[in-house]
């Protein structure tokens, strides 16, 4: 449900999109999660706009959000996590646009950390593990993460894979030998909680070794 | 239209055990959070369990804590409560509830449940 | 854990106003948001009041809810009152994931 100004004052507000999205991040901070919203369209003038959360609340019927810069932000442990949060543009008193959104269901994993990849010679293959903050958390434990690796001179080639351990193994017959290769990763949530992919973790390169075998070939990637 | 239909009461010894079903229709289930409230005969509402839209979050009053179990089937838009242990301070109509986009509920008709030896 | 505490019964004549109160025994009442359910004999609980004093589509606007901090009370005020009012009504509220209900007050239109 969407309400508008009203309001002479607010004629012009009234011609703008308000339209804006938002994600969650559950126990980013200890128990502290946190909400960030932000309007799709880049232009909108922000001067005198705020945002409002109602509803699914412990203990309060409504917290307003803090600006930092573009986006709105909040850090609470006051999300009850049951039903859905009437979340408003406000201009004053005026909502010019609400969304009601269950929180558990935009929820934005942490970018997965410690991404590294071992060669294994006896192999011939390569283990790549990383970790993410998610194993310690009570609520969003459960992610499906993609692994991307490209040669390096391939700037759109990536090869994705999708995995739900912290651990792959990459055959080296796949990769092309003696080549530069980058990798990431990135989460998304996969059980009970719906949402957004994760930012992806910063990447990782490593080299291919040369080939050794006697007949000199590899499966191309 | 919101339709809840709860079904499976019915006569129980003491120390028995019972499984209800509330049948969902009219509305988008799997995004709904769903409670169980019973009303003893002559008596007030009685909260006893929610469940989130996807099953993970569930909560219990004090009074069926650890013999009641709240489920739900989104497959099938289908809410349960399986009730062991059952005691004779359990008899009541008993209802579910769907809670709307905030707390506006929807409720069914209940189904009796009567322990009783 | 807090309690919501309702009076037993009220009465009003028909076209008259009547007002039920909701006290909350511990906490703000402005803390979490407060529904009122009506209940006719042999039936369901309908919602008449959500959100304090949101009304669902349907119901008239004979029925308006509010809250009075300094009270720490929720009320629920029914005017030109019916016959079909005569009921029993149930505040709610929310206490972390539990909820709370009111016993109830039995409303008699004499």
């Known amino acids: 449900e969407s309400g508008y100004a009203q309001n002479g004052d607010l004629e012009d507000a009234e011609l703008d999109d308000y339209s804006f999205s938002c994600y969650s991040q559950l126990e980013v901070n200890g128990s502290q999660h946190s909400l960030t919203c932000a309007f799709e369209d880049p232009d909108v003038n922000i001067t005198n706009l705020e945002f409002e959360i109602c509803g699914a609340l412990v203990e309060v019927k409504c917290l307003n959000f803090r600006k930092l810069q573009e986006i709105y932000f909040i850090e609470t442990k006051k999300f009850l996590l049951i039903g859905k949060s009437n979340i408003c543009v406000k201009v004053g008193e005026k909502s010019l646009t609400c969304k009601k959104i269950d929180l558990t269901t935009i929820v934005k994993p942490e970018a997965p950390f410690d991404l590294s990849v071992v060669y294994r010679e006896g192999a011939n293959d390569f283990v790549v593990t990383f970790n993410t903050s998610h194993l310690q958390k009570k609520y969003v434990k459960v992610l499906m993460h993609d692994v991307a690796y490209r040669q390096e001179k391939d700037e759109n080639k990536w090869t994705h894979v999708n995995l739900s351990s912290t651990k792959l193994t990459l055959l080296q017959r796949k990769l092309q030998p003696a080549a530069m290769y980058e990798i990431k990763v990135r989460s998304i949530p996969d059980h009970y909680f719906k949402g957004f992919w994760s930012e992806w973790s910063p990447s990782y390169y490593f080299r291919t070794p040369e080939i050794n075998n006697s007949s000199g070939e590899m499966d191309p990637i | 239209q919101v339709n809840l239909r709860e079904s499976g009461g019915g006569l129980v010894k003491p120390g028995g055990s019972l499984r209800l079903s509330c049948a969902a229709s009219g509305f988008t289930f799997d995004d709904s959070v769903m409670h169980w409230v019973r009303q003893a005969p002559g008596k007030g509402l009685e909260w006893l369990s929610l469940?989130?839209?996807?099953?993970?979050?569930?909560y219990y009053a004090d009074s069926v804590k650890g013999r009641f179990t709240i489920s739900r089937d989104n497959t099938k838009n289908l809410l349960y409560l399986q009730m062991n242990s059952l005691r004779a301070e359990d008899t009541a109509v008993y209802y579910c509830a769907r809670q709307g986009d905030y707390m506006g509920n929807n409720w069914g008709q209940g189904t009796l449940v009567t322990v009783s030896s | 854990n807090f309690m919501l505490t309702q009076p037993h019964s009220v009465s009003g004549s028909p076209g008259k106003t009547v007002t039920i109160s909701c006290t909350r025994s511990s906490g703000s009442i402005d803390s979490s948001y407060v529904q009122w359910y009506q209940q006719r004999p042999g039936n369901s609980p309908t919602t008449v009041i959500y959100?304090?004093?949101?009304?669902p589509s349907g119901v008239p606007d004979r029925f308006s809810g509010s809250i009075d901090s300094s009270s720490n009370s929720a009320s629920l005020t029914i005017s030109g009152l019916v016959t079909e009012d005569e009921a029993d009504y149930y505040c709610q509220s929310y206490d972390f994931h539990h909820l709370v209900f009111g016993g109830g007050t039995k409303l008699t239109v004499l």
């Open positions: 469940v989130g839209w996807d099953g993970f979050f569930t």
């Open positions: 959100e304090d004093d949101q009304r």
